[in-house]
């Protein structure tokens, strides 16, 4: 028995509006009906939880109202979007997937997506 495999892209560049999207796909060893997805950020030897959501298979992924994440699910694939990113948020974003129900419990952790965020240059003042 090995850890559940979780795949995610190696690198993503956030948009000029500070939005980054990536897919987190997991190889489910069983027929899970309740799945928990957590996005973790590792940078400068610190690990912080960015957001988390639990969803029932076939239903929408629901994050807390004040979460910077949104997402949709389709089978064993979760499409994640993180917004409000700034240059200081550049780091390795890791997808953690837990199959909560029915037993047995499984845990999988992706290899991380390096998200690069570049703050847009302020528009120069115009003389019009």
């Amino acid at each position: 028995c090995k850890a559940m495999h979780v795949a995610q892209p190696a690198v993503v560049l956030a948009s000029s509006r500070g939005i980054a999207s990536f897919v987190c796909e997991y190889a489910s060893p069983g027929k899970a009906t309740e799945v928990r997805v957590t996005v973790l950020r590792q940078a400068d030897s610190q690990v912080t939880e960015v957001c988390a959501a639990t969803y029932m298979m076939g239903n929408e992924l629901t994050f807390l109202d004040d979460s910077i994440c949104t997402g949709t699910s389709s089978g064993n694939q979760v499409n994640l979007t993180i917004q409000g990113l700034r240059a200081m948020d550049t780091g390795l974003y890791i997808c953690k997937v837990e199959l909560m129900y029915p037993p047995p419990y499984y845990l999988g952790i992706g290899n991380g997506t390096q998200i690069y965020v570049i703050d847009p240059e302020p528009c120069p003042d115009s003389d019009f």
Epitope: S45, Q46, K96
Partner: nanobody
């Protein structure tokens, strides 16, 4: 299915020793980091130590007093606790995390990465 079972907790005098054991079933040890965590009453669960194939890491408060080791033939991980202090009193948990290339010495023990948890064993250190 990965399962972990601890043993070895109990009562010790200040300055004494205890050895905790964590038996891992359902997998070999190699794909995982095995960590020890503890939770004192009214406090958050905190990292004690963890170990993978290549290295071990310790929380600052236990360095030099606690030693983590693993026996791959028996699928066991041990936590040898020496020079115990009353503040070491807590429920101790062993847990497993998939071993990842991006883990550093500072992050491989981070509680966010763990998901397979044992039931916990009480350690009480009396003064």
């Amino acid at each position: 299915e990965v399962q972990l079972v601890e043993s070895g907790g109990g009562l010790a005098q200040s300055g004494g020793s205890l050895r905790l054991s964590c038996a891992v079933s359902g997998s070999t040890l190699d794909p995982f980091v095995i960590g020890w965590f503890r939770q004192a009453p009214g406090k958050e669960r905190e990292t004690v130590s963890c170990i993978n194939r290549n290295r071990a890491s310790y929380a600052d408060g236990v360095k030099g007093r606690f030693t983590i080791s693993r026996d791959t033939a028996k699928n066991m991980v041990y936590l040898q606790m020496n020079s115990l202090k009353p503040e070491d009193t807590a429920v101790y948990y062993c847990a497993a995390s998939p071993d990842k290339a991006f883990y550093t010495d500072q992050t491989m023990c981070n509680i966010h990465y763990y998901g397979y948890w044992a039931q916990g064993t009480q350690v009480t250190v009396s003064s």
